[in-house]
């Protein structure tokens, strides 16, 4: 799990924009993005 401020902020933003169980979030968190690039 990612517990940095950035990841926590992104998770909160995702929860606030949750629609039908699918998170509509354009901010890719560091635990996802940093593994790809």
């Amino acid at each position: 799990a990612c517990d940095t401020a950035t990841c926590v902020t992104h998770r909160l933003a995702g929860l606030l924009s949750r629609s039908g169980g699918v998170v509509k979030n354009n901010f890719v968190p560091t635990n996802v993005g940093s593994k790809a690039f």
Partner: antibody, heavy 111, light 112 residues
């Protein structure tokens, strides 16, 4: 370890299509699965990704709600394509953390 | 949104020579190094060569190397071989931007 896309084909404008990404040989839950597309003769374009740990999804803003990524089983992820236009004609790739790519599946939008 | 720009768009290089491809990000990338390089041959999916700007992916020949930091990055192929003929793309990531993932337009490397 492998990733493979399926479900591509010919679809009419304003139509819908569901693409499936099937993974094998690795722990699915600890990875993110990315969708990237490539129009004929053009470059790579990020669509979105899903973190399999919690199912969170992330999209490029141009997607604008037309596409949706879901985890449908322990080894499969889908990309639902809606309101398709000719400009969506492309090869659609699924990739694990961008380090393991499938061969792609071609989606052609034409009347 | 980040924008990735790659130069040149095409490069012709003799076998055995060294070629350098440049990649520029419109903003500093995550950790100053969230930059990957991909190789794509016709009819094939992309293959990741470099990640974290300079780390060689597993199984990639050592003639490939990546460098740079922040917004300016390079891919260098030393002692180019015929098998290196392909299109190369850089892709970058920034965590605090909407559309914080982007790919550049690519560089076609032709081996003479």
């Amino acid at each position: 370890q492998s990733v493979e896309e399926s479900g591509g084909g010919l679809v009419q404008p304003e139509g819908s299509l569901t693409l499936t990404c099937t993974a094998s040989g690795f722990d699915f839950s600890s990875n993110a699965m990315w969708w990237v597309r490539q129009a004929p003769g053009k470059g790579l374009e990020w669509i979105g990704c899903i973190y399999n740990g919690d199912g969170s999804t992330y999209y490029a803003s141009w997607v604008n709600g037309r596409f949706s990524i879901s985890k449908t089983s322990s080894t499969t992820v889908t990309l639902q394509l809606n309101s398709l236009t000719v400009a969506d004609t492309a090869t659609y790739y699924c990739a694990r953390d961008l380090d393991l790519w499938g061969p792609g599946t071609l989606v052609t939008v034409s009347s | 949104a980040i924008v990735m720009t790659q130069t040149p768009s095409s490069k012709s290089v003799p076998v055995g020579d060294t070629v350098t491809i440049n990649c520029q990000a419109s903003e500093s990338l995550y950790n100053n190094n969230a930059l990957a390089w991909f190789q794509q041959k016709p009819g094939q999916p992309p293959k990741r060569l470099i990640y974290d700007a300079s780390k060689l992916a597993s199984g990639v020949p050592s003639r490939f190397s990546g460098g740079g930091s922040g917004t300016q990055f390079t891919l260098t192929i030393s002692g180019v071989q015929c098998d290196d003929a392909a299109t190369y793309y850089c892709g970058g990531y920034r965590s605090d931007s909407v559309d914080g993932v982007a790919f550049a337009g690519g560089t076609e490397v032709v081996v003479k």
